[in-house]
């Protein structure tokens, strides 16, 4: 299996944005790569977003996706937006080398993303 590395812990910003790098130990320069972000919480795994990209090109997620990303060599910089406290969980990076063959699959150990909902601003009198 292909080795995939990602940070153990990331804290989302007060605006509910979390970014992390997913790096894969490619055996060579794949021309087509698929990156999937999975969320594991309470022993359930759900797909957050996925993108297939050609090496040298930008990642393209679906228009309604909460993910954006850029690639550089064998690194993918992923950003997940719109996170709330209830979205806290383990976010796993899955990388597939789709072309040329043979197919390679790598799954990271996951990044624990902590999301803290911002405190509502108290009314202030001037």
């Amino acid at each position: 299996a292909m080795h995939v590395a990602q940070p153990a812990v990331v804290l989302a910003s007060s605006r509910g944005i979390a970014s992390f790098v997913c790096e894969y130990a490619s055996p060579g320069k794949a021309t087509e790569v698929r990156v999937t972000v999975l969320r594991q919480a309470d022993s359930q795994v759900t797909e957050v977003c996925a993108a297939t990209y050609m090496m040298g090109n930008e990642l393209t997620f679906l228009d309604d996706s909460i993910c954006t990303g850029t690639s550089s060599g064998n690194q993918v910089n992923l950003t997940i937006q719109g996170l709330r406290a209830m979205d806290t969980g383990l976010y796993i990076c899955k990388v597939e080398l789709m072309y040329p063959p043979p197919y390679y699959l790598g799954i990271g150990n996951g990044t624990q993303i902590y999301v803290i909902d911002p405190e509502p601003c108290p009314d202030s009198d001037f």
Epitope: A25, S26, P27, G28, K29, A30, T31, G73, N74, L97, P100, P101, P102, Y103, Y104
Partner: antibody, heavy 118, light 107 residues
Framework: QVQLQESGPGLVKPSQTLSLTCAVS?????????WNWIRQPPGKGLEWIGY???????YYNPSLKSRVTMSVDTSKNQFSLKLSSVTAVDTAVYYC???????????WGQGTTVTVSS | EIVMTQSPATLSVSPGERATLSCKAS??????VAWYQQKPGQAPRPLIY???YRYSGIPARFSGSGSGTEFTLTISSLQSEDFAVYFC?????????FGQGTKLEIK
């Protein structure tokens, strides 16, 4: 696990064509990967000659391109190298090796020594 | 083509000591660098790929680092079986190229 084995004449006369074959076992050539030839002159470093792909595509080192031809025989699960108009500088150990496209070489043959001499 | 320059050409180290081998690329190759070990009469054996990842079965005393144009192979505590020739290899750009090798010998 994949194994590669080179074969061919150990002695070639100057101006003739060097012909080598690499037999692959434990993996079907047509399933993927790229199949390479690399050589090592006596006491020197490694020189990549080129590859032939699982799909028949190829790329040769520009320094040797005019003299190199590679082919693949999927029915015999082997690939071959032909190097024409050889001279003494082509004397080397010739290795066949496997890699992922533009990748490192994860499997090598044991190498076969070719001497160019009259 | 990309030229890979290894230094030193020969390195003399005592068993149990640390060995550091250098490889410089003539242009940026990202992290697409591998290292091989070759013993007399044998084919090269992959040690490290993608700059820092050990090939399967390679002991933890072998480690790789670097990016761009400068790369290092470190052997933390030399064993008798580690004395050999080491080659770096770039697979960022065709034609694929190798360094000229560093001979690691017993001091």
């Amino acid at each position: 696990q994949v194994q590669l084995q080179e074969s061919g004449p150990g002695l070639v006369k100057p101006s003739q064509t060097l012909s080598l074959t690499c037999a692959v076992s434990g993996y079907s050539i047509s399933s993927g990967y790229y199949w390479n030839w690399i050589r090592q002159p006596p006491g020197k470093g490694l020189e990549w000659i080129g590859y032939i792909g699982y799909d028949g595509s190829n790329y040769y080192n520009p320094s040797l391109k005019s003299r190199v031809t590679m082919s693949v025989d999927t029915s015999k699960n082997q690939f071959s190298l032909k190097l024409s108009s050889v001279t003494a500088v082509d004397t080397a150990v010739y290795y066949c090796a496997r890699n992922y496209y533009s990748g490192y070489f994860d499997s090598w043959g044991q190498g076969t020594t070719v001497t160019v001499s009259s | 083509e990309i030229v890979m320059t290894q230094s030193p050409a020969t390195l003399s180290v005592s068993p149990g000591e640390r060995a550091t081998l250098s490889c410089k690329a003539s242009q940026n190759v990202g992290t697409y660098v591998a290292w091989y070990q070759q013993k007399p009469g044998q084919a090269p054996r992959p040690l490290i790929y993608s700059t820092s990842y050990r090939y399967s079965g390679i002991p933890a005393r072998f480690s790789g680092s670097g990016s761009g144009t400068e790369f290092t192979l470190t052997i933390s505590s030399l064993q008798s079986e580690d004395f050999a020739v080491y080659f770096c290899h770039q697979y960022d750009t065709y034609p694929l190229t190798f360094g000229q090798g560093t001979k690691l010998e017993i001091k």
